[in-house]
């Protein structure tokens, strides 16, 4: 068959066709009708909105647009009992409470249903006790506390300010350490960017504002309720006691301006060095308890939300593909947002709506793409990504034999400094050929490549002359997509300077004042980056869909298994005479990477001279470039982390939003000094080695000549 | 812009309550800040009295806790004093401000014109 | 309470002169500390907050420097119109003014 018979117009220029039909100004003009009022997962505006991008979608010309419900547990604040701090004296009076919502933005006085700053599936409890302040939070901070400076936060409510790792294992880590409670605040350290002025006048965060979001540890796992399986009419779900991922103590966010108040009286150890002190006006003491005066003052919570199992509503379009219709290339982002999403996600939203629109543009011209392209609109992301990991627990079974990419389309932009992109090693070069193509955006690089300003603003630290594309973590819609099924995935998004700029992530991030204004007036007024995001994810969802030959390059993959191999290998040497004693060997592995490395260069070479006139041959090598990705999944998943099941790749065992490479050995040597049984910890080690090497080969043997 | 202005009897009897009203224009006092009573002694001694946030909470100066009560009307954008069982040492100029902040550091952005109170029989 | 002491309690310099204010608290404040300026029938107005930095509208030749819990206003190439008295505020825990510095001409 024709590669191009359902259109008598080039590739290239269906290509350009496509990315000529992107408009800046419709993508402004789309966040700002997905962004005046709040979109809150499991409320009826949300399901408004489905069922207005379900109508305007098939308006665009999509085969086929429908709506896939799940009911989840999700999670809201008590509306008459509202969440608070409080600061009390010995007769339980409240001295100090802390602010019941965010002072609304201008222009916004009057919209209802903005949900106060809350914990997401935080439990109800009323603790009271001695502070401790314990950083970030991460698990290097509370080693920090317990094991050099001897503080117990046993029976204690901890406060923790946000950034560098997933506020989930902040609680987690609280959890661990005994503590009674968890206060999250963002500090200016994190979330103000020096001279730059608080919204409205600026994009820094206002004392007031809070960042919201969930706290679940549910390492893939979808609806808590009924991991590994859809929550569809039919579901058995578990009791709330076996949920998967629910923290067991009460937990609540706070802006700065309240932290100020409860951290200026903090007594007790002094930070034990500055990497503790953020830039509030108060000592950061770490506590526990208030200091002089005000030791017998304690901090007590009242957190009264509740988990409600509740109804949500993905948006599922379909482009059917002319060639091979049953090879799936899926472009997703989420619909539901904390607030007004000006940012997260609507800025991601709006930008695929532009790329459905121009799909359908094609479409009606009598074009149609090679392959099936999906289009997905997920409900529930801010609750743990629950509405792309249900549908894909619906259609695991199709996607694992059809699924050959998924690109994410969360925020469009972070920051408006350069690109950035988290991808698989497969696409590698599709990324590079692809920003090669298209022009930059940026000041000073006008009439030069994407590809040039990126690699100007954003060097690998390995390759000269090449940007840097970072590993995948999780913390977004892809997940359960890469980690658990195994399919090609990437993100791309414009983002800020990290050289200059070291808050964590954008400062209005899940804030009241994530407004389209703060687009339009701060972030990208011409909607330019905005544009290059579309061109980026659109380009590479084209490419991915309608090229003869998948755009997946192996090499790439043989390249980055040889340097996590020696990163792995040099945090084990750390250890040299428990290697010797227990007869650690790396061997298997590296041997593994080199017969991957053979092998993927062999396979190169046959990809570029076999006969893709002969449609047998073309789908037998299509299908071993799409099913490498499926190759380094184990079907046994990770230790206590079933749907994690990558070899290469896995959300850290720290962060969720950072990838670790090899996490099976990672976790296994980590921290392996402290651990009461050598022998036993050692031992995983040289299991998971085995795993490692094992997965390695049995996907390098994917590649060879199938007889 | 923002305006504060305070207004209220200029003459109190010891062991009464003095009740002041502070006007905002050009601002809701629901949609941000905390909104607070200053004084200023005829020595010039200034005094931070108490303050009620933006959500209705309330905070304090220690030294007046048991006598002073700080209170809102949102509908007329006004908030208000009442300082209880007034001595002659409660005379005082009052002033009404705006608290800002920045970095969590507190300050008092717009003020009132001040109104004289005096405590005498 | 944290007492904060201002010094000298007044000060006489002319015109073109640089002139420094101190302010010292009872404890470490943090760097949580404002200045304001007070002219003779008018309200307090903002002029150094957090320290160090200058609030919108004032002139540069005002600058506040200081940690712990000893802080400073510096008013550089005094102008007539910088009579005033300056107050400094702590904002650390409670709010507590010192007594203030009254600035005259020559």
């Known amino acids: 068959k024709s590669s191009n018979e359902a259109t008598n117009i080039t590739p290239k220029h269906n290509m350009k066709a496509f990315l000529d039909e992107l408009k800046a100004e419709n993508i402004k003009k789309f966040l700002y009708n997905f962004t005046q009022i709040p979109h809150l997962a499991g409320t009826e505006q949300n399901f408004q909105l489905a069922k207005q991008i379900q109508s305007q979608w098939k308006e665009f010309g999509l085969d086929s647009v429908e709506l896939a419900h799940y009911d989840v547990l999700l999670s809201y604040p008590n509306k008459t009992h509202p969440n608070y701090i409080s600061i009390i004296n010995e007769d339980g009076n409240e001295i100090f409470n802390t602010s019941l919502f965010e002072p609304p933005p201008p222009g916004y006085e009057n919209v209802s249903d903005i949900v106060p700053p809350f914990s997401a599936f935080s439990p109800q409890g009323m603790p009271e006790g001695d502070l401790v302040y314990v950083n970030y939070a991460r698990t290097e901070d509370f080693f920090k506390l317990e094991r050099d400076m001897k503080i117990n936060c046993s029976g204690k409510i901890v406060i923790a300010r946000y950034g560098k790792v997933f506020r989930g294992n902040k609680v987690k880590n609280a959890q661990l350490a005994g503590a009674k409670g968890v206060i999250l605040y963002s500090d200016p350290a994190d979330y103000f960017a020096p001279g730059v002025k608080s919204y409205p006048d600026g994009w820094n965060l206002p004392g007031g504002g809070v960042q919201r979001g969930n706290i679940l540890n549910l390492n893939g796992a979808g609806d808590p309720l009924t991991p590994g399986y859809p929550a569809n009419e039919y579901a058995y779900r578990r009791g709330i006691a076996e949920a998967v991922g629910l923290p067991s103590i009460p937990v609540h966010p706070i802006g700065y301006y309240d932290a100020q108040k409860l951290l200026e009286k903090m007594g007790g150890s002094a930070p034990p060095d500055s990497s503790w002190r953020g830039s509030l006006k108060v000592p950061y003491n770490v506590g526990p308890g208030f200091t002089g005066n005000f030791s017998t003052q304690k901090v007590k919570m009242h957190i009264h939300s509740t988990n409600e199992v509740t109804r949500i509503y993905n948006v599922i379009g379909t482009l059917r593909g002319a060639v091979e219709p049953d090879r799936y290339v899926i472009l997703g982002g989420h619909r539901d947002s904390w607030v007004f999403g000006g940012i997260d996600p609507q800025s991601g939203a709006a930008v695929v709506h532009e790329i459905v629109r121009s799909f359908g543009t094609l479409k009606k011209e009598g074009w149609r793409p090679r392959r099936t392209i999906l289009f997905a609109s997920w409900d529930a992301e801010e609750f743990g990504l629950l509405g792309s990991t249900e549908w894909a627990e619906e259609n695991s079974r199709l996607l694992q034999e059809r699924g050959v990419a998924y690109i994410n389309a969360d925020s469009s932009i972070e920051g408006n400094y350069t690109l950035r992109v988290d991808c698989t090693p497969l696409m590698y070069s599709l990324v590079h050929n692809l920003t090669k193509e298209l022009k930059s955006p940026d000041e000073g690089f006008e009439g030069k490549s994407l590809y040039e300003s990126w690699t100007k603003k954003s060097p690998s630290p390995e390759f000269s002359g090449m940007p840097r594309i970072s590993k995948l973590g999780s913390g977004n819609d892809f997940e359960v997509f890469f980690q658990r099924l195994g399919i090609a995935s990437g993100r791309a998004r414009y983002t800020k300077n990290w050289e200059t700029n070291k808050f964590s992530g954008y400062p209005l991030y899940h804030s009241v004042y994530e407004t389209y204004e703060l687009v339009e007036k701060f972030y990208d007024p011409m909607f330019k980056y905005h544009l290059t995001v579309a061109q980026v994810r659109g380009g590479m969802v084209f490419e991915l869909a309608n090229s003869i030959v998948l755009p997946f390059d192996c090499r790439d993959y043989a390249v980055v298994l040889r340097k996590y191999a020696d990163k792995i290998y040099s945090i084990s040497m750390k250890h040299p005479q428990e290697m010797k004693t227990y007869s650690v060997s790396f061997d298997s592995l590296f041997s593994a990477v080199k017969n991957f490395t053979e092998i993927a260069s062999k396979f190169s070479e046959r990809l570029q001279d076999f006969d893709k006139s002969n449609p047998i041959v073309l789908r037998m090598m299509n299908d071993q470039l799409m099913f490498l990705e499926r190759a380094f999944i184990d079907p046994l998943g990770l230790p206590d982390r079933p749907f994690y099941r990558h070899v290469i790749y896995a959300p850290s065992s720290h962060n969720k939003y950072a990838g670790e490479s090899f996490p099976g050995i990672y976790d296994a040597l980590f921290d392996i000094e402290s651990k009461v049984d050598p022998s036993k910890a050692w031992g995983e080690v040289k299991r998971q080695i085995y795993v490692a090497a094992f997965t390695v080969q049995a996907a390098a043997e994917t590649l060879s000549e199938v007889a | 812009e923002v305006k504060l202005q305070e207004s209220g009897p200029g003459l109190v009897k010891p062991s009464q309550s003095l009740s002041l009203t502070c006007s905002v224009t050009g601002y809701s006092i629901t949609s941000g800040y905390y909104w607070n009573w200053i004084r200023q002694f005829p020595g010039n001694k200034l005094e931070w009295m108490g303050s009620?946030?933006?959500?209705?909470?309330?905070n304090y100066n220690p030294s007046l806790r048991n006598r002073i009560s700080i209170t809102r009307d949102t509908s007329k954008n006004q908030f208000f004093l009442k300082l209880n069982s007034v001595t002659t040492e409660d005379t005082a100029t009052y002033y009404c401000?705006?608290?800002?902040?920045?970095?969590?550091?507190?300050?008092?952005?717009?003020w009132g014109q001040g109104t004289l109170v005096t405590v005498s029989s | 309470d944290i007492v904060m002491t201002q010094s000298p309690a007044s000060l006489s310099a002319s015109v073109g002169e640089t002139v420094t204010l101190t302010c010292g608290a009872s404890?470490?404040?943090?760097?949580?500390l404002n200045w304001y300026q007070r002219k003779q029938g008018k309200s307090p107005q903002l002029l150094i907050y957090g320290a160090t930095n200058l609030a919108d509208g004032m002139s540069s030749r005002f600058s506040g420097s200081g940690s712990g819990r000893q802080y400073s206003l510096k008013i550089s190439s005094l102008h007539p119109d910088d009579v005033a008295t300056y107050y400094c505020q702590n904002v650390f825990r409670t709010y507590t003014f010192g007594g203030g510095t009254k600035l005259e001409i020559k």
């Open positions: 009620i946030s933006f959500d209705g909470n309330n």
């Open positions: 401000a705006r608290e800002g902040d920045y970095y969590g550091s507190s300050f008092f952005t717009y």
């Open positions: 404890e470490n404040i943090y760097g949580a």
